[in-house]
């Protein structure tokens, strides 16, 4: 029960996280014009990964895409790449985790397969979250560097008479969305990995028991079921739940320790 809850919660948290990463990547407000200690302008500038926008106090907003690849800063390209990798990994992780959910029955998929899929999706979510956090952090670092550089020469004299105020940019809403979303995806991934441990097949805990039958002796020892035990070609260990309340599915799906031949 706890395993199912952990897995389900991990899935939901990751889903929210990845939705947030997608939202952050698409948002225009990665950097916004710094209004503190600046003359009040009737124009507000903000920039995203894909376009820059200008909002006038009149209400008119104009956005222009970055229609160049080679002309863009390498750091911006790196951030784009990290966010896209994060989204792709997260999307694949979501797809994998849907089939790995314990509450979803797909044919005769075994627990070991579900455990592997849960672990795979968990790792994907972790890497996806890390990509998003890294991307946002690289962009934030770039902003901080540029902010202090433009502060150092904020007022550049023109002929000693006229002054040009340089537009400084500070953290936009997308950065905070990205950090939170990356964190959620990371947490979701960790939860999936924890859930995987609960799903993974384990060695049984009880000691070997001897049963004396008439005429010959059969020792039932923990380990793989052999073909001769009557389970056909299924040579894989099945998880044996000993103790605790079982769901109807568990009772039906898994041989108990008393299912001896």
């Amino acid at each position: 029960m706890a395993v199912t809850a952990c897995q389900g919660l991990g899935f939901v948290v990751s889903l929210i996280g990845i939705a947030g990463i997608i939202a952050a990547t698409c948002m225009d407000q990665w950097s916004t014009q710094d209004l503190y200690n600046n003359p009040v302008t009737a124009v507000f500038n903000y920039q995203g990964l894909w376009r820059s926008c200008v909002r006038e106090s009149s209400g008119f907003t104009e956005c222009r895409g970055y229609f160049t690849l080679l002309g863009l800063p390498a750091m911006l390209q790196a951030v784009r790449a990290l966010m896209i990798v994060g989204i792709v990994l997260g999307a694949i992780g979501l797809l994998v985790s849907i089939f790995a959910l314990k509450c979803i029955r797909i044919g005769s998929m075994e627990d070991s397969a579900k455990a592997n899929m849960t672990l795979t999706s968990g790792i994907m979510f972790i890497v996806s979250g890390l990509c998003a956090i890294a991307g946002v952090s690289v962009f934030a670092n770039m902003l901080v560097t540029n902010f202090w550089m433009s502060t150092a020469n904020m007022y550049t004299g023109m002929g000693g008479m006229v002054q040009t105020v340089q537009t400084r940019y500070t953290f936009g809403a997308a950065l905070f969305v990205g950090w939170v979303a990356g964190g959620l995806t990371l947490i979701g991934g960790v939860m999936m990995c924890i859930a995987c441990r609960g799903l993974a097949p384990e060695e049984t805990n009880y000691k070997a028991v001897s049963y004396h039958a008439s005429g010959h002796s059969v020792a039932y020892k923990p380990g793989g079921f052999k073909a001769s035990t009557g389970f056909g070609s299924n040579t894989k260990n099945k998880k044996i739940y000993d103790g605790g309340a079982r769901t109807e599915d568990e009772v039906q799906s898994y041989p108990s320790k008393h299912d001896y031949v």
């Epitope: 302008t41 500038n45 920039q47 200008v54 008119f60």
Partner: antibody, heavy 118, light 113 residues
Amino acid sequence: EVMLVESGGGLVKPGGSLKLSCAASGFSFSNSAMSWVRQTPEKRLEGVATISSGDSYTYYPDSVKGRFTISRDTAKNSLYLQMSSLRSEDTAVYYCTRQGYGNAMDYWGQGTSVTVSS
Amino acid sequence: DIVMTQSPSSLTVTAGEKVTMSCKSSQSLLNSGNQKNYLTWYQQKPGQPPKLLIYWSSTRESGVPDRFTGSGSGTDFTLTISSVQAEDLAVYYCQNDYYYPLTFGAGTKLELK
């Protein structure tokens, strides 16, 4: 057709108050930035108050800050300028304007005259 | 506040003549975000409110004759009337539309010889 009609001007004593109104029609009033601009007897133009689209911000020059208040009633499509502690230098024709592209004042009313004199 | 300086204060011209008037701002009106200059030109005829001619320093308002041309960037701007007509006799104002408070120049009065 865009129409801006000012009213409420008149003669007032120094230190007195006056409220100007501007009835707007023919455009999306609530989504537009609006301004009051005055023209002095010497024909100088001065922006005295601006309210941004969505009413997010109001702006005033230092000469009127604390004395003038711009507001709007979107239900009535009306813009207001509450003027208090009036001085003789506030004597002017007050225009109600709408801001368009480039924050430029693309539509102006005919103006209402305010005279501050004892 | 941004100071807008217009020159000359008045111009006496003959019909058909090319006219140029200048406007200088104390700070750059160029917005780095969209590379547009927030400088506006108005025309005011006697007894009328000002009328918008040009915004973004060079974009003509719809209905404005193409003999009116705005140019310039940063702090120096120019309004040119390629061939003055009798109906162009008015006062021309430039305005800073970038920094609050939005300030106007003192105007250039266009008169007939």
